[in-house]
Interface confidence: low
């Protein structure tokens, strides 16, 4: 159905509150440096305009596209040239180039300081004083730090955030109530951001086909009772939703996501028996619930895969007549039977199956050629299984911090050219896979670990793309989405690396280290470890262990000293000299 006014259509569908929130998120994701007040003003003006168009669709400018309206609004920002430099040139372009230009300027690493919560009393006062402004500030702060955050999901988290304050600001001990709840929400938000960034990268770098394949595998595992046509329909709609959000079309994205939730609830009988309680919730919670819903039970009477994909005489005919549909069916059938496999592994198996058919269907005797195809999957399955087993054993032995350090050493040796903050950030996140997945039952470990690693390695790829310094990282990131993790796992020590010159400043520490929270203290130590490795890449694990042990003792000693700063300035150079001698 064609609407006279696109903006009125979205305003009517979404309602004023969600509309205003999404506009605020969109502007904050595009103009990440602008102050909150400027964005509130822009969002208010756009919402007022949309409301006027909803009242009178043939009003002036109401027929303009959303990109035109939003772009025109962004280009009115006076400080655009000063704050964003090149980005101001976007305003000289016509749509759709102008929007593409804004998208290309999104900064995945804007370098804002981490959000530090003020005192609970001050927070509660601000919350009670102006709830709408308080939640708007939350949307703004998350959106500008995460320019690809899945906008409808961010509205959901803002609602959760509101719930936490509504509850805890009534509590006797506000801090005790807020602390753990805010921290738990923060973890969820960070994971959500990384997952959506991975989806956007899949779409932007590898195209719709890659994203659809990923979604077919994931949804087939989750809804094994649904038939392939139903999975395909949901995947097609889901692809549209994520393409819109990744492309900055947040109003369309949120609207289409609500429509998809409605469709799934109206057709739950043919999708999954687990959707019932999600479908009774309001729209934001409903969509979130559906996205997180537990896996349905497998149907009991699934025939062997071999019948359709190996033994059937028509395999090559079926493949050649409709390659993507046939391969999609294979992926669907394999995934629904193997909920314990990671999505990445399932996609590798489908790729292997495709390569086998390409080769065999061109021979004189295809059935003989592909007869053992399913047996040939074994090494592909064994590789992630062994990797998870080995790394979980290491995690259990070392604990999270020790495991992170082991990964830091591993990844710094693989790609020493990568910036130290990136190596520290990525290795710390990779290390969290242990905490997140190793305690799970065997049947869930691989899926948890490998799919989480894919998301974290995507962060490395995104950061590296901004300033490419390592050919091998570029290669692993760009050659194949499903083989990224095996590619990184397979990287050996970079023998071509020329050690970094020693810089005493890098290893100079001060008393302020003592007052840092534990996590930040760890980051400082891990930064020193990376720098040490960049200076002495041939250092053995044993040597590094000794040096890091000495470093920990040095920090502990100086933080306990009467004159902390004096201790750091006196003992620090001795430690550095000893470390250099130990690492010769």
């Amino acid at each position: 159905e064609a609407y006279k006014s696109e903006i009125a259509h979205r305003y009517n569908d979404l309602g004023e509150e969600h509309f205003r929130g999404l506009v605020l998120v969109a502007f904050s994701q595009y103009l990440q440096q602008c102050p909150f007040e400027d964005h509130v003003k822009l969002a208010k003006e756009v919402t007022e305009f949309a409301k006027a168009c909803a009242a009178e669709e043939s009003g002036a400018n109401c027929d303009k596209s959303l990109h035109t309206l939003f772009g025109d609004k962004l280009c009115t920002v006076a400080s655009l040239r000063d704050k964003y430099g090149d980005m101001a040139d976007c305003c000289e372009k016509q749509e759709p180039d102008r929007n593409e230009c804004f998208l290309a300027h999104k900064d995945d690493n804007p370098g804002f300081p981490p959000l530090v919560a003020p005192e609970p009393d001050a927070l509660c006062a601000a919350f009670q004083d102006n709830e709408q402004l308080f939640l708007g500030k939350y949307l703004y702060e998350i959106a500008r730090r995460h320019p690809y955050f899945y906008a409808p999901e961010l509205l959901y988290y803002a609602q959760q955030y509101k719930g936490v304050f509504a509850e805890c600001c009534q509590a006797a001990d506000k801090a005790a109530c807020l602390g753990p709840k805010i921290e738990a929400l923060r973890e969820k938000v960070l994971l959500s951001s990384a997952k959506e960034r991975f989806k956007c990268a899949s779409l932007q770098k590898f195209g719709d086909r890659a994203f659809k394949a990923w979604s077919v595998a994931r949804l087939s595992q989750r809804f094994p009772k649904a038939d392939f046509a139903e999975i395909s329909k949901v995947v097609t709609d889901l692809t549209k939703v994520h393409k819109e959000c990744c492309h900055g079309d947040l109003l369309e994205c949120a609207d289409d996501r609500a429509d998809l939730a409605k469709y799934m609830c109206e057709n739950q009988d043919s999708i999954s028996t687990k959707l019932k309680e999600c479908c009774d919730k309001p729209v934001l919670e409903k969509s979130q619930c559906l996205a997180e819903v537990e896996r349905d039970e497998l149907p009991g009477d699934l025939p062997s895969l071999a019948a359709d994909f190996v033994e059937d005489k028509e395999v090559c005919k079926n493949y050649q007549e409709a390659k993507d549909v046939f391969l999609g069916t294979f992926l669907y059938e394999y995934a629904r039977r193997h909920p314990e496999y990671s999505v990445s592994l399932l996609l590798r198996l489908a790729k292997e199956y495709e390569a086998t058919l390409e080769k065999c269907c061109a021979t004189d005797d295809p059935p003989t050629c592909y007869a053992k195809v399913l047996d040939e999957f074994k090494p592909l399955v064994d590789e992630p299984q062994n990797l998870v087993k080995t790394n979980c054993e290491l995690f259990e032995k070392l604990g999270e911090y020790g495991f992170q350090n082991a990964l830091l050493v591993r990844y710094t040796k693989k790609a020493p050219q990568v910036s130290t903050p990136t190596l520290v950030e990525v290795s710390r996140k990779l290390g969290k896979v242990g905490t997140k997945c190793c305690k799970k039952p065997e049947s869930e470990r691989m899926s948890c670990a490998e799919d989480f690693l894919s998301v974290v390695l995507n962060r490395l790829c995104v950061l590296h793309e901004k300033t490419p310094v390592s050919e091998r990282v570029t290669k692993c990131c760009s050659e194949s989405l499903v083989n990224r993790r095996p590619c990184f796992s397979g990287l050996e020590v970079d023998e071509t690396y020329v050690p970094k010159e020693f810089n005493a400043e890098t290893f100079t520490f001060h008393a302020d280290l003592c007052t840092l929270p534990e996590a930040e203290k760890q980051v400082k130590k891990q930064t020193a470890l990376v720098e040490l490795l960049k200076h002495k890449p041939k250092a053995t694990d044993e040597q590094l262990k000794t040096v890091m042990g000495d470093f920990g003792a040095f920090v502990e000693k100086c933080c306990a000293a009467e004159n902390k700063e004096g201790c750091f300035s006196e003992e620090g150079p001795k430690l550095v000299a000893a470390a250099q001698a130990a690492l010769v």
Partner: nanobody
Framework: EVQLLESGGGLVQPGGSLRLSCAAS????????VAWFRQAPGKGREFVAG????????YYADSVKGRFTISRDNSKNTLYLQMNSLRPEDTAVYYC???????????????????WGQGTLVTVSS
């Protein structure tokens, strides 16, 4: 490492046209932001036109807008500059420059480009 090699320069009359090519090796051209700069005798390097990495967003200096067109052929790993309605003041050595990493937007600042070709001379004179 990116190697760039320009060609297509020469002598042309005012109002005439030329097409410059820049062949890249060592990295795919669509993975880098690339630009044309020029340097007239006794002057500094001046941005002419650029195209973003991973996205075909083009930029032009005001002095060439509407006359010059930048494009690339990913299959040939080559960047082009189609120059029409040439004027005597377009006389210069034209350089192709690359700034790896996508989706980077081209910049008009020469210092931000680590890789340069050796240049090709364009002379506009009657």
């Amino acid at each position: 490492e990116v190697q760039l090699l320009e060609s297509g320069g020469g002598l042309v009359q005012p109002g005439g046209s030329l097409r410059l090519s820049c062949a890249a090796s060592g990295r795919y051209i669509d993975e880098t932001a690339v630009a044309w700069f020029r340097q007239a005798p006794g002057k500094g390097r001046e941005f002419v036109a650029g195209i973003g990495g991973g996205v075909d967003i083009t930029y032009y200096a005001d002095s060439v807008k509407g006359r010059f067109t930048i494009s690339r052929d990913n299959s040939k790993n080559t960047l082009y500059l189609q120059m029409n309605s040439l004027r005597p003041e377009d006389t210069a050595v034209y350089y192709c420059a690359a700034r790896p990493g996508r989706p980077l937007i081209t910049s008009k600042v020469a210092d931000l480009y680590p890789y340069w070709g050796q240049g090709t001379l364009v002379t506009v004179s009657s």
